[in-house]
Amino acid sequence: IWELKKDVYVVELDWYPDAPGEMVVLTCDTPEEDGITWTLDQSSEVLGSGKTLTIQVKEFGDAGQYTCHKGGEVLSHSLLLLHKKEDGIWSTDILKDQKEPKNKTFLRCEAKNYSGRFTCWWLTTISTDLTFSVKSSRGSSDPQGVTCGAATLSAERVRGDNKEYEYSVECQEDSACPAAEESLPIEVMVDAVHKLKYENYTSSFFIRDIIKPDPPKNLQLKPLKNSRQVEVSWEYPDTWSTPHSYFSLTFCVQVQGKSKREKKDRVFTDKTSATVICRKNASISVRAQDRYYSSSWSEWASVPCS
Amino acid sequence: RNLPVATPDPGMFPCLHHSQNLLRAVSNMLQKARQTLEFYPCTSEEIDHEDITKDKTSTVEACLPLELTKNESCLNSRETSFITNGSCLASRKTSFMMALCLSSIYEDLKMYQVEFKTMNAKLLMDPKRQIFLDQNMLAVIDELMQALNFNSETVPQKSSLEEPDFYKTKIKLCILLHAFRIRAVTIDRVMSYLNAS
């Protein structure tokens, strides 16, 4: 058993039928010695008396809010949560496996630049009685500070018969140098509590590997005289690290016809303009990627050819 | 990106072209190592990230763009001094910091060159003959060093009398390649920045 936060405790259980469970001793936080009784949740049934209560925790029915009273007055509470170990592996019932970029990806994180600021998100089908707490650090043995905000519900989607809820959190490394070469990964730890079930999820990454620039901005077309060609121009996104001559991007320019089946013409360039043939009803799209370290491409910025 | 790329002419700054070749070569070598050594811990998640130049050179600090010198977190200054002449500085007014930066890059390349050559000698003794260093990568390191053209004491190639542990050597190769790729990215950024200045 260990303390998650004040008056909230996590009991780790090897989850199998007829398991002996864990013996837990609760102590009432009071100077009183006599006349103390214990109850669980909203029940008025007295579970025991005295300053301590010894219980055998085997299943969810044994978890919950234990309260010690004296003469009708509440003295203190202890909330017991369960963390299930299923055949040697901690349960992952609360969050959905996003399966991207690989199986067992419960937390996904992205950064728009090298400032040390990043966003992580996760998915669940659970809509109520759900709380998250996020901690982060650079490295684990001698951790350096990363500050995370509160996790918030950022999107709701309908997936088949189920509703899916997306939660996200923003974190910022306390003293980040955009030009630094990372040798210790960022560690992100999410504590998830659903009713009386506790689970924890972790992700470890280098900022350089989770970079995804915003799409190029100010995408414009300039027709060239007496030609089907147009000059496409764009700018670096505002959120990208500066100076741009140091943090350079490379770009992919795509001409896409109205039909998805039509052949796509693609050009790659390090410049912020390109000359392409604009077909009728086609659209021109541009996306960006770090020029020197191939992490993710940005989403496309698009304009119609007409 | 194995697709056609319209790259700008390196123009006045001869080192930019070499640094781009260097990054391409080390990235290819790392990819080859990850594929060939698939049963070894060779991915970014699995290896220990070590920097053989730590406390010996200060490339990141010495080559910091002016715009980032206001960032306190970037000014983790380390006392270092380097010889300051080099042909990449040709026909350019350069500050002491720029010379320091380029000589730091030269020292990095020299240290990696020695490590890679020592390692290759060991890998050539492996009866499995599983992996060797790409001669192109070693040649590109050499070309960039020549372009930088700093006078520097030659570092003798390390020789080892004991029987090499090929498993450890291959893991060390992965560690070195990951670190060198990160340094090659920094070098490319620096050359691009200097070229634009």
Epitope: P17, K85, E86, I89, D93, K102 | -
Partner: antibody, heavy 115, light 112 residues
Framework: QVQLVESGGGVVQPGRSLRLSCAAS????????MHWVRQAPGKGLEWVAF????????YYADSVKGRFTISRDNSKNTLYLQMNSLRAEDTAVYYC????????WGQGTMVTVSS | QSVLTQPPSVSGAPGQRVTISCSGS????????VKWYQQLPGTAPKLLIY???QRPSGVPDRFSGSKSGTSASLAITGLQAEDEADYYC????????????FGTGTKVTVLA
């Protein structure tokens, strides 16, 4: 006393279907994930499918994906394996088993796919 | 095909010590715990070892398990006639969990 009893096996022609059941007793069935494992005659053990305690997630071996469906009815304390488009290579003893460290297995039910 | 490799057979005289190896990789045995099962002819597998080296109650202490890196082993000391059976190791892969990974199986023969 934890008990798992499989049923529904038999002889079936290739391309036909069969539904196996696994009746659980002596424990809180709805609290545990469950597996189906099979063993072809004279061969080793092969994992077939898994279902979460609440039925929310299902996983399958590549060899049965798209043909077999695992399901459970927690009100009946029963695990099921719906087997469609059966092939000769599906011939095996099928076991159900709890997803726990101290696991419990059923006695198995024989499925023979033969023309 | 199984990704956990076991020797097809091992044998020993009564009273002897035999060991069965189970070889995997970093993503399975290297990252997860190992179980061992005994299967007598015509019966369901019986759990011998869980969490690499733990014996459920009722399993004789002649059976012991261990794990090191990407491989595990089962040792049977004081071999007895009733130990003649098939033995399987089992683990998970960190990327395909909860799919069960079984070893190829080892036939233990007790020499007369």
């Amino acid at each position: 006393q934890v008990q798992l009893v499989e049923s529904g096996g038999g002889v079936v022609q290739p391309g036909r279907s069969l539904r196996l059941s696994c009746a659980a007793s002596g424990f809180t069935f709805s609290s545990y994930g469950m597996h189906w494992v099979r063993q072809a005659p004279g061969k080793g053990l092969e994992w077939v499918a898994f279902i979460r305690y609440d039925g929310s997630n299902k996983y399958y071996a590549d060899s049965v994906k798209g043909r077999f469906t695992i399901s459970r009815d927690n009100s009946k304390n029963t695990l099921y394996l719906q087997m469609n488009s059966l092939r000769a290579e599906d011939t095996a003893v099928y076991y159900c088993k709890t997803h726990t460290s101290h696991d419990n297995w059923g006695q198995g039910t024989m499925v023979t796919v033969s023309s | 095909q199984s990704v956990l490799t076991q020797p097809p057979s091992v044998s020993g005289a009564p009273g002897q010590r035999v060991t069965i190896s189970c070889s995997g990789s970093r993503s399975n045995i290297g990252s997860n715990t190992v179980k061992w099962y005994q299967q007598l002819p015509g019966t369901a597998p019986k759990l011998l070892i869980y969490y690499n080296d733990q014996r459920p109650s009722g399993v004789p202490d002649r059976f012991s398990g261990s794990k090191s890196g990407t491989s595990a082993s089962l040792a049977i000391t004081g071999l007895q006639a009733e130990d003649e059976a098939d033995y399987y190791c089992q683990s998970y892969d960190r990327y395909t969990h909860p799919a069960l990974l079984f070893g190829t199986g080892t036939k233990v023969t007790v020499l007369a």
